[in-house]
């Protein structure tokens, strides 16, 4: 349904508040270095223009595409060349190439200062003084640091952020009320950003079909009572929403997401019995709730899959004539029966099934060739099951911090060329799989763990893509989306790696470590651990443990000393010498 003015259409659909918020997010995700005030000015100009188009859709420029309007606006930024360098060249291009160019310059690891949380009283004052600016600033700071954050979901986070301040700034103990809420929002926000980043990587690097396959599997697990045609419709709509958001079309994305939520709620009887509560909520909460809704119960007495996908005489004919439909049906039927499998495992099974049909269907006796295809699934299922079992046992034995350290050592030995901050960040996140998933019963462990690991490994992939240093990382990241985790798991110690030169400066610590939070102190120690492994990749677990124990004792001792700085200087030298001796450096 074509509209005379796209900008007027979206303004009317979304309302002024959401329109302004989404334009701010879009601009901050594109121009990540621009000051807040500049973005607010641009957003106000776009909003005023949109209002003129609402009043008269035939007004000048109102018929232009949103990409043209927004791109033209971004290209008016005076400091574009000096702030963004070659990104300014995008402005010389025509749409749609200009928007593609802006997308390519999105930076997953922008050089921005860490967000420091002010005192609670300072935040509450700022919130009361100018609530609108305070909330816009939140959108801006999150969007510029997370250029692929799912925009309609960020509106939901902003709503919760506002609610936290509204409630807690009136509380007797503001800090006790507010800080846990802000911590929760921060942690959920990081997780949400990472999950969306995987969706965008899936679409951008592996194409629409890969995303659709993921969506078929996930929605079939979630809505096992829904018919295949219903799941297919939801997949098509969901793909459109995420394609738009990942492509920077945030107004269309938010609008289409609202339409999808409306459709799901109007048709919940044929989708899932678990949607009732979600559908009673306001729009932003409703969409979030639907996205997180628990799996519905599996229909009773589902027939064996073998009848349609192995025993039927029409298997090859159906496959050859419409692979997407036939393999989609296979994936749907398998996924709805297996909420206990990860999505990536289901996709591996579907790929194995497809490969077998492709190999067998032209053979003299196709059925004999593919009759045992389901037997090929057994090792594919057992591999993640065994890996999760082993790692959960290790996690339960070590606890989160030491489990992270085990992963740090493991991954540094696999891909030592990767930067230390990236290895620390990724391994810490990989280690969180323990507390996140190992508490679950067997039936929920694999979907929790392996799908979470896919999200974390995608962080490694996008960070590595910016400055590639390891062929092994590139290979695991680009060859197959669903086999990334098995690919990294299969990597052994990189025997080609030339150990890093020893640099005492890397292992010199100061009294400031004593004032750090427990988390920051862990990161310092883990950074040192990665550097140790890079210097001595052949160091044994026992050697590394001894050095890390000595290091922990050294920090504890010096933080208790009267003259901390002297202690760190003198004891630090001794520690470095002892560590060198212990590791044979």
């Amino acid at each position: 349904d074509a509209h005379k003015s796209e900008v007027a259409h979206r303004f009317k659909d979304l309302g002024e508040e959401n329109f302004k918020a989404l334009v701010l997010i879009a601009f901050a995700q594109y121009l990540q270095q621009c000051p807040f005030e500049d973005h607010v000015k641009l957003v106000n100009e776009v909003t005023e223009f949109a209002k003129t188009c609402v009043a008269d859709e035939s007004a000048e420029n109102c018929d232009k595409s949103l990409h043209t309007l927004f791109g033209d606006k971004l290209c008016t930024v005076a400091t574009l060349r000096e702030t963004y360098g070659e990104m300014a060249d995008c402005c010389a291009k025509q749409e749609p190439e200009r928007n593609e160019c802006f997308l390519q310059h999105k930076d997953d690891n922008p050089n921005l200062p860490r967000l420091v949380r002010p005192e609670v009283d300072v935040m509450c004052t700022a919130f009361h003084d100018n609530e609108e600016t305070f909330l816009k600033k939140y959108l801006y700071e999150i969007a510029r640091r997370h250029p692929y954050f799912y925009a309609p979901e960020l509106l939901f986070f902003a709503k919760r952020y506002k609610a936290a301040f509204t409630e807690c700034c009136q509380a007797a103990d503001k800090a006790a009320c507010l800080l846990p809420k802000l911590d929760e929002l921060r942690d959920e926000g990081k997780a949400s950003s990472a999950k969306q980043r995987l969706k965008c990587a899936s679409l951008q690097k592996f194409g629409e079909r890969a995303f659709k396959a993921w969506a078929v599997a996930r929605l079939s697990q979630r809505f096992p009572k829904a018919e295949f045609a219903e799941v297919s419709k939801l997949v098509t709509d969901l793909t459109k929403v995420h394609t738009e958001c990942c492509h920077g079309d945030l107004l269309e994305c938010a609008d289409d997401r609202a339409d999808l939520a409306k459709y799901i709620c109007e048709n919940q009887d044929s989708i899932s019995s678990k949607l009732k509560e979600c559908c009673e909520k306001p729009l932003l909460e409703k969409s979030h709730c639907i996205a997180e809704v628990e799996n519905d119960e599996m229909p009773a007495d589902l027939p064996s899959l073998a009848a349609d996908f192995v025993e039927s005489k029409d298997v090859c004919k159906n496959y050859a004539e419409a692979k997407d439909v036939f393999l989609g049906m296979f994936l749907y039927e398998y996924a709805r029966r297996h909420p206990d499998y990860s999505v990536v495992l289901l996709l591996r099974l579907a790929k194995t099934y497809e490969t077998t049909l492709e190999k067998c269907c032209a053979a003299a006796d196709p059925h004999e060739c593919y009759a045992k295809v389901f037997d090929e699934f057994k090792p594919l299922v057992e591999e993640p099951q065994n890996l999760i079992k082993q790692n959960c046992e290790l996690f339960e034995q070590l606890g989160e911090y030491k489990f992270q350290n085990a992963l740090l050592v493991r991954y540094t030995k696999k891909v030592p060329q990767v930067s230390t901050p990236t290895l620390v960040e990724v391994s810490r996140n990989l280690g969180k799989v323990g507390s996140k998933c190992c508490k679950h019963p067997e039936a929920k462990r694999m979907p929790c763990a392996e799908d979470y690991l896919s999200v974390v490994l995608n962080q490694l992939c996008v960070l590595h893509e910016k400055t590639p240093v390891s062929d092994r990382v590139t290979k695991c990241c680009t060859e197959s989306l669903v086999n990334r985790r098995p690919c990294f798991s299969a990597l052994e110690v990189d025997e080609t790696y030339v150990p890093k030169e020893f640099n005492a400066e890397t292992f010199t610590f100061h009294a400031d470590i004593c004032t750090l939070s427990e988390k920051e102190r862990q990161i310092k120690k883990q950074t040192a651990l990665v550097e140790l492994v890079k210097h001595k990749p052949k160091a044994t677990k026992e050697q590394l443990k001894a050095v890390m124990d000595d290091f922990a004792a050294f920090v504890e001792k010096c933080c208790k000393a009267d003259d901390k700085e002297t202690c760190f200087a003198e004891e630090g030298k001794k520690l470095v010498a002892a560590s060198q001796a212990a590791l044979g450096l």
């Epitope: 050859a320 692979k323 032209a362 003299a364």
Partner: antibody
């Protein structure tokens, strides 16, 4: 040495029929999928259809109804029956084997030398 | 409707030149079901590359293929006298009935 050899081409009047043969030597045809591909003079390649080892056939949308592929494994030969021929069917017709291990992919590793079919009054 | 667009339709080049031929498909081909063929006048086509980037046995390493989804490229890194020919891409889709070839690219001597 594996060879595919097409025959049966020639001049045919519009509306007429023709049956082309593809004789295979050096391999047992019963294990392979064979395609028919044509090329109009000075033009590009156009896929007509395929017959799997099991005898199952598939055709390009435009070829359905007028063209039929069959095989006789005892003679190690595949056939292309063409009916209601038109001037635009004038082309060199090739048979080609699909790379073993693929069923629906456009990977044709062994080709005949082609046979010319001319449809003209 | 399936469209397989090859460009350029012809290219003049000298021995030793690097030649790049592109193939654009709409919709995207089925998981890298893309091949490249070489055809010389009066001869049958010869399969060079399958699965977008895999070289058929016996094909010189100066030939390489890349791409995925909708956009594919055949590159001849250093053109040899025997490489002057017409090149075709072939695509496989969700339905086998949609199997299609590109329009061809003639590589001529400059």
């Amino acid at each position: 040495e594996v060879q595919l050899l097409e025959s049966g081409g020639g001049l045919v009047q519009p509306g007429g029929s023709l049956r082309l043969s593809c004789a295979v030597s050096g391999i047992d045809l019963s294990n392979y999928a064979i395609n028919w591909v044509r090329q109009a003079p000075g033009k590009g390649l156009e896929w007509i259809g395929i017959i799997w080892a099991s005898g199952t056939t598939f055709y390009a949308t435009w070829a359905k109804g007028r063209f039929t592929i069959s095989r006789d494994n005892s003679k190690n030969t595949v056939y292309l029956q063409m009916n209601s021929l038109r001037a635009e069917d004038t082309a060199v017709y090739y048979c080609a084997r699909t790379v073993p291990g693929y069923s629906t992919a456009p990977y044709f590793d062994l080709w005949g030398q082609g046979t010319l079919v001319t449809v003209s009054s | 409707d399936i469209q397989m667009t090859q460009s350029p339709s012809s290219v003049s080049a000298s021995v030793g030149d690097r030649v790049t031929i592109t193939c654009q498909s709409s919709p995207s081909v089925w998981f890298n079901f893309l091949s490249w063929y070489q055809q010389k006048p009066g001869k049958a086509p010869k399969l060079l590359i399958y699965e977008a980037s895999k070289l058929t046995s016996g094909v010189p390493s100066r030939f390489s293929g890349s791409g995925s989804g909708t956009d594919f490229t055949l590159t001849i890194s250093s053109l040899q006298p025997e490489d002057f020919a017409t090149y075709y891409c072939g695509g496989g889709y969700s339905s086998i009935s949609d199997t299609t070839f590109g329009g061809g690219t003639k590589v001529e001597i400059k």
